[in-house]
Interface confidence: low
């Protein structure tokens, strides 16, 4: 690492990966092991994240830039910077204060996160269902009905209101 | 990076009333709820009620549902707040805050700057 | 609503000493409680979660106990940066509600 001085402001010249040093008459040393500084001019480095327990290391710290967590087989990230990881549900399910549950009749979630939303309610554009629902997929909306021929019919069930349970806070 | 945005300081005469906007960038708008929360001056926090960009679904604190109107524009990424009828006890910043969709576990990760509301005839 | 009664409402202590802040709900919230902190012109920022869950990024030394009515923010050793207002958060049902707050001073 080169150890620059500079007339003016001696610390301008430390480069990230550096900081500059008062101990040591405003040099620039080099990050300390499990440090970083991502920008120039730092009088501090930054202690890498360290990815514990239900995390797990995406990218590795550098004496540039932080660790990056994600989280282990099973659970997703939440939060800035994946600062909490939350278990993973089955589509067809929501993650609720009992744990995973089945999305109930009308509601559908694809994801292995999130919860259960409405089916659409096709009629609400003035189509049919073309292919109903499940927990895991939406419904599929055709043709309206006066498209379609003599004969055939479709049901459109109402899309349940949201419990408030539903919310975050 | 994920950033909310409020807008500017409001001096407003009682009865009166405001609306604040909350831009977010830098995340998917639509996938997070916006919670709007308060604090008077020198008061503790308060949660007024919460919107789900997707589809526009709320919920209300009841102290508020009758003066509160929470909405977004997904086009510009923007959550607002209406408070109408105001009074001199709604003086405070408002601050908005994003939480992720679950229930479950949810904490205010991401705020805005806050935005001082003033009521004063 | 559930009430959320934080106590002291403020305190004073040393560099180095341990602090303790209590939040009592009117009703059992299982463990469905949050503390922030709050430094002066600033948003609040998330500690712990779930009351005894250390989000990531935040030090060892703040850690949460309880469950049911009853729940503790306690930092074991008190550091200048430390000098907030401390709230805790209770998120079982809606509306979310928030204790009164604690301001934490240096002795």
């Known amino acids: 690492f080169e150890r620059t001085r500079s007339l003016q402001d001696p610390c301008s010249n430390c480069p990230a990966g550096t900081f500059c040093d008062n101990n040591r008459n405003q040099i620039c040393s080099p990050c300390p092991p499990n440090s970083f500084s991502s920008a120039g001019g730092q009088r501090t480095c930054d202690i890498c994240r360290q990815c514990k327990g239900v995390f797990r290391t995406r990218k590795e710290c550098s004496s540039t830039s932080n660790a990056e967590c994600d989280c282990t087989p099973g659970f997703h990230c939440l939060g800035a910077g994946c600062s909490m990881c939350e278990q993973d549900c089955k589509q067809g399910q929501e993650l609720t204060k009992k744990g995973c549950k089945d999305c109930c009749f009308g509601t559908f979630n694809d994801q292995k996160r999130g919860i259960c939303r409405p089916w659409t309610n096709c009629s609400l554009d003035g189509k049919s269902v073309l292919v109903n629902g499940t927990k895991e997929r939406d419904v599929v909306c055709g043709p309206s009905p006066a498209d379609l021929s003599p004969g055939a019919s479709s049901v459109t069930p109402p899309a349940p209101a949201r419990e408030p349970g539903h919310s975050p806070q | 990076q994920v950033q909310l945005v409020q807008s500017g300081a409001e001096v407003k005469k009682p009865g009166s009333s405001v609306k604040l906007s909350c831009k977010a960038s830098g995340y998917t708008f639509s996938s997070y709820w916006i919670n709007w929360v308060r604090q008077a001056p020198g008061q503790g926090l308060e949660w007024i009620g919460n919107?789900?960009?997707?589809?526009?679904?709320?919920n209300y604190n009841q102290k508020f549902k009758d003066r509160a109107t929470l909405t977004v524009d997904k086009s510009t990424s923007t959550a607002y707040m209406e408070l109408s009828s105001l009074r001199s006890e709604d003086t405070a910043v408002y601050y908005c805050?994003?939480?992720?969709?679950?229930?479950?576990?949810?904490?205010?990760?991401?705020w805005g700057q806050g935005t001082l509301v003033t009521v004063s005839s | 609503d559930i009430q959320m009664t934080q106590s002291p409402s403020s305190l004073s202590a040393s560099l180095g000493e341990r602090v303790t802040i209590t939040c009592k709900a009117s009703q059992d919230i299982n463990s469905y409680l949050s503390w922030y902190q709050q430094k002066p012109g600033k948003a609040p920022k998330t500690l712990i979660y779930r009351a005894n869950r250390l989000v990531d990024g935040v030090p060892s030394r703040f850690s949460g106990s309880g469950s049911g009515q009853d729940f503790t923010l306690t930092i074991s050793s008190l550091q200048p940066e430390d000098i907030a207002t401390y709230y805790c958060l209770q998120y079982d049902e809606l509306p979310p509600t928030f204790g009164g707050g604690t301001k934490v001073e240096i002795k």
């Open positions: 919107i789900y960009p997707s589809d526009s679904y709320t």
């Open positions: 805050t994003r939480t992720w969709e679950f229930y479950y576990d949810s904490v205010f990760d991401y």
